[in-house]
Every structure is written in structure tokens, then in C-alpha cells.
Interface confidence: low
């Protein structure tokens, strides 16, 4: 049976959703155990000009063999505002000083990157010693980059479309996901649903996405179920502000008690057989509806308190 | 919407403290660089200093003119930004606005008074 | 520190004439943001990365500028236009403003 319920783009000022993945365009993580110098090579596109970019790069100290050196290429297309936060890390920084300016002097060694193309870039890494990662990156608000993380399979690291590159990078798009959201048709009441859509990633190991809610309302105004939908290998930790009806696949776990682990349910896997989810638990609003990229750590907020749904 | 109310301003004497609060809804705190500014009257607008997200270990950045009296830190789960003053001069009586920077200090609150006279 | 000199520190204009406010930095600076301040009021965004226009500023605004000249130009002012501009960097520490335009009705 179709359910009627028209989505459309909800105003940020009535929900908003952020998110942190591994996911990227194009990318690769190889191994390159024994080399002295780790190399990272970052491609990063700004499409709306200059931008504000929090880059963190993190250690971990494997084996006592920490720190080696590294080699962090950062190749951009337009003005950067750049905080950079390397503590403890022997790092060298390949830029174009014409495009990137720092927060404050960033305090490690730095060499002018040549104006090549993509390619060519990753050669010019590549003489300097082996590639650990490479990533193109669209937009980014933030980024973490784990060094000595490496569980590439490849010795090689060759850019390729639609990668995941699991602990060794996190990042922030600074564009919000697109919320969407409906009236049930022919539903009474006011329990709001808010579904959150996690597709498959390119790699199916076991993940735990988080899934921070904050709903700006007083825990009495509030009737609502939170929908989560992803694939097998995807549990849930659930951190929120209020007390609503839970709906997941998978399983999942509140942050107050993360030992407790919960059953969840079989859902579909299409945007109707959801909306027919939400109306099947009395839902008369969805409030939001979002479809994001496989992801570590989601964050929605909404202020939609039942029964007052504006679309933009 | 996102919105930024100072409080905790008021009259004290030079060499005294007085501590800033700023509650911030709207937005995820957390994740903000948060701001000071001043302005002192029929003056012009001073950076007094910042603090950083989470992500950046709440790291903080000061102007030179209040480097060693003020403080700033932040209570992520209480929305709350503060900002300590202690051994109070007289030209750092001003208006005080909270801030948060995204790209350029995008939001304000609306000030609070802070005058230090004997 | 990098020194933000706003010229003029006043100006007085009619509505409907063009308005330039400028912002010369002591030394380079990737880009320039502005604000604008009615009196009693808080600072507003008002321009960010020199040529941006914040949310809700209307398109008589602009910006623009490199290296250490920017500019703020109004194409024709309006009754609400009136106020105090200042500019702001923080391509180096520590971050500065200018020392504020204030425009005023002839």
C-alpha cells in the first residue's frame, strides 16, 4: 500500500543534521610498514571559495615505534583558512601558501607543494616515500587523520572512486544532509517520526554509528519514535535529550548504559517502506527524514515538537 | 535559531573579578569556536579572545591586553561559555558580547555592561 | 599585530547616493570581513572572505579587495543602511578590526 506523505526539504531552522564519515569520492589506504616517513596525500575541493578548515591529525603509538616522520600533502582548490592541530607529531607540510593560511603559525616544517595536477601530485608524494593514504575530500568542515592506522590491504595506494577509509580518516562535509520531511495523511494525533537513513559504505566490516539527538522541546510536549535504518553489520549507540519510542535495525545501545545491548527489528530499506513504518506507530508527522552516507557519528536537531511541521 | 545571551556584567572596583556567563542554544555548542569581544564606550570593537571546539581540545587564544587576567572556558553540556576577569582596570570597562566564529563571527548576543570605577 | 585603518572614519550621504567604505591592513591578508552596528545594538554579519554578503544583507552590498586594500560598497543607500561598518581579519594573530565607518545621513 503507498503511503501518502509528500517529502520536502525541511528549513534548517526546524532540523539540521550533521555528520562524520570515512567515507570518500576517491581515496586509498595501503600499508607501508617499515617506511621511515608516512606520506598522506589530501585533495581538497571548496566549491562556494574561501572556507574554514579543522585538520587533526592524531598518533598512535604501535609497538613503541612511534614517532616516524610524516609527510602531509594538502592540495586545494581555493583560499583556506586552515587550524591545524599536530601535537607531538614530527610533521612535514607540502601546501600551496598562496591558498592555505594559517590560524596561527602551525609550527612544523613546510614546503611549497608545485602546482601540478592530481596525478602528478600523487607522484611527486609518492618519490618522497610511500603513500599511507590518499583521499579527495568535497567540501570539508573538518577532518581527522589517524597516523600508524593503516589496514589497507594494498601496498600500493592508487586513487579509486567510493572508498572507505576506516580508521585512518574521519571527516566532517560542512554542508548539513538534507532533511526532509511530511504529513502522514489520514494519521490523528501528534507523535512525530524522525528516520535516519545510514546506505551501505564500501566496506561491510561491523560499525557502530552514533546518533546524537536534540530535540529543543519540554520532555512533556514530546510524543515521537526515532527510526534507524542501516545495513546488517550497522549497530547504534543513541544519545538523547529526550525519552522517545525506539525503532532500528541492528542493534542498539543508549550512552548511558553503552552495555547494555538491544535487539532491534527488521525494517525495510526503501524511503516508502519506512514512511509505512513511521504510519504503522501512529505517526502523524515525520518530521524528519534523512538519507546519509555510512557514517560514524550523526547529530540531529529539530525544534518541531509535534503537530507544527514547516517545510522550506 | 541560534542565539547567544550574555549576563554577569555590572559595576566593580579596579582590581576586582567578575565572571561572564553566555547561554547558547540553537546550534551545536560543542562543536563552536566561541568568542569575546568588547567594545568600550563610543569606542570601536576589541577582540578579547577564544575558545575552540572539542575536536580542538578547547584550546584557548587570548588578545595580549587581557593576556594573564582573563579567562575563558566553556561547559559544553551545559551550553555555557564563560569568561573569568580578574584584576579589573578601568579600560576594561566595555560592552562584552559572546560570539561564535564559523568562517566570520556569524552570531552575537546582545551584550552585557561590565564598568570598573571606584 | 596587523593594523586595521578604515577610511574615512565618517561619512555623511544621501539615500540613493553610492557609498565606498575602505579597510587598508598594515600588511597582507587573505581576506577581509565586515559588520555592521546600529547604536545600542550588537555588531551584525554583515560581509565574510571579502566578497560574501551574510544571510539577509541585501545585493546593493559588496565587497571586495586583495592583499592589504578592501572594500564595502553600498550602490545606493538606504534609510537602514545607516550605521557603523567595521572591517575584521584573522590572517594572523592576533585578530583585529577597524577602527569602524560611521555613515551618516546628510
Known amino acids: 500500500e503507498t503511503v501518502h506523505c509528500d517529502l520536502q526539504p525541511v528549513g534548517p531552522e526546524r532540523g539540521e543534521v550533521t555528520y562524520t564519515t570515512s567515507q570518500v569520492s576517491k581515496g586509498c589506504v595501503a600499508q607501508a610498514p617499515n617506511a621511515i616517513l608516512e606520506v598522506h596525500v589530501l585533495f581538497l575541493e571548496f566549491p562556494t571559495g574561501p572556507s574554514q578548515l579543522e585538520l587533526t591529525l592524531q598518533a598512535s603509538k604501535q609497538n613503541g615505534t612511534w614517532p616516524r616522520e610524516v609527510l602531509l600533502v594538502l592540495s586545494v582548490n581555493s583560499s583556506v583558512f586552515l587550524h591545524l592541530q599536530a601535537l607531538g607529531i614530527p610533521l612535514h607540510l607540502a601546501y600551496n601558501s598562496s591558498l592555505v593560511t594559517f590560524q596561527e603559525p602551525p609550527g612544523v616544517n613546510t614546503t611549497e607543494l608545485p602546482s601540478f595536477p592530481k596525478t602528478q601530485i600523487l607522484e611527486w608524494a609518492a618519490e618522497r616515500g610511500p603513500i599511507t593514504s590518499a583521499a579527495e575530500l568535497n567540501d570539508p568542515q573538518s577532518i581527522l587523520l589517524r597516523l600508524g592506522q593503516a589496514q589497507g590491504s594494498l601496498s600500493f595506494c592508487m586513487l579509486e572512486a567510493s572508498q572507505d577509509m576506516g580508521r585512518t580518516l574521519e571527516w566532517r562535509p560542512r554542508t548539513p544532509a538534507l532533511v526532509r520531511g511530511c504529513h502522514l495523511e489520514g494519521v490523528a494525533g501528534h507523535k512525530e517520526a524522525h528516520i535516519l537513513r545510514v546506505l551501505p559504505g564500501h566496506s561491510a566490516g561491523p560499525r557502530t554509528v552514533t546518533v546524537k539527538v536534540e530535540l529543543s522541546c519540554a520532555p512533556g510536549d514530546l510524543d515521537a519514535v526515532l527510526i534507524l535504518q542501516g545495513p546488517p553489520y550497522v549497530s547504534w549507540l543513541i544519545d538523547a535529550n529526550h525519552n522517545m519510542q525506539i525503532w532500528t535495525t541492528g542493534e542498539y545501545s543508549f550512552k548511558i548504559f553503552p552495555e547494555k545491548n538491544i535487539r532491534g527489528f527488521k525494517l525495510p530499506d526503501t524511503p516508502q517502506g519506512l514512511l509505512g513504518e513511521a504510519r504503522m506507530l501512529n505517526a502523524s508527522i515525520v518530521a524528519s527524514f534523512v538519507e546519509l552516507p555510512l557514517a560514524s557519528i550523526v547529530s540531529l536537531h529539530a525544534s518541531s515538537c509535534g503537530g507544527r511541521l514547516q517545510t522550506s | 535559531e541560534v542565539q547567544l545571551v550574555e549576563s554577569g556584567g555590572g559595576l566593580v572596583k579596579p582590581g576586582g573579578s567578575l565572571r561572564l556567563s553566555c547561554a547558547a542554544s540553537?546550534?551545536?555548542?560543542?562543536?563552536?569556536?566561541m568568542d569575546w569581544v568588547r567594545q568600550a564606550p563610543g569606542k570601536g570593537l576589541e577582540w578579547v579572545g577564544e575558545?575552540?571546539?572539542?575536536?580542538?581540545?578547547?584550546?584557548?587564544y587570548y588578545a595580549e591586553s587581557v593576556k594573564g587576567r582573563f579567562t575563558i572556558s566553556r561547559d559544553d553540556s551545559k551550553n555555557t561559555l564563560y569568561l573569568q576577569m580578574n584584576s579589573l582596570k578601568t579600560e576594561d570597562t566595555a560592552v562584552y558580547y559572546c560570539?561564535?566564529?564559523?568562517?566570520?563571527?556569524?552570531?552575537w548576543g546582545q551584550g552585557t555592561l561590565v564598568t570598573v570605577s571606584s | 599585530d596587523i593594523q586595521m585603518t578604515q577610511s574615512p572614519s565618517s561619512l555623511s550621504a544621501s539615500v540613493g547616493d553610492r557609498a565606498t567604505i575602505t579597510c587598508r591592513a598594515s600588511?597582507?591578508?587573505?581576506?577581509m570581513h565586515w559588520y555592521q552596528q546600529k547604536p545600542g545594538k550588537a555588531p551584525k554579519p554583515w560581509a565574510y572572505?571579502?566578497?560574501n554578503l551574510a544571510s539577509g544583507v541585501p545585493s546593493r552590498f559588496s565587497g571586495s579587495g586583495s592583499g592589504t586594500d578592501y572594500t564595502l560598497t553600498i550602490s545606493s543607500l538606504q534609510p537602514e543602511d545607516f550605521a557603523t561598518y567595521y572591517c575584521?581579519?584573522?590572517?594572523?594573530?592576533?585578530?583585529?578590526f577597524g577602527g569602524g565607518t560611521k555613515v551618516e545621513i546628510k
Open positions: 540553537g546550534f551545536t555548542f560543542s562543536d563552536a569556536w
Open positions: 572572505a571579502t566578497s
Open positions: 600588511s597582507s591578508v587573505s581576506y
Open positions: 560570539t561564535r566564529w564559523r568562517r566570520f563571527f556569524d552570531s
Open positions: 575584521q581579519q584573522w590572517s594572523s594573530n592576533p585578530l583585529t
Open positions: 575558545i575552540r571546539s572539542q575536536a580542538s581540545n578547547h584550546a584557548t
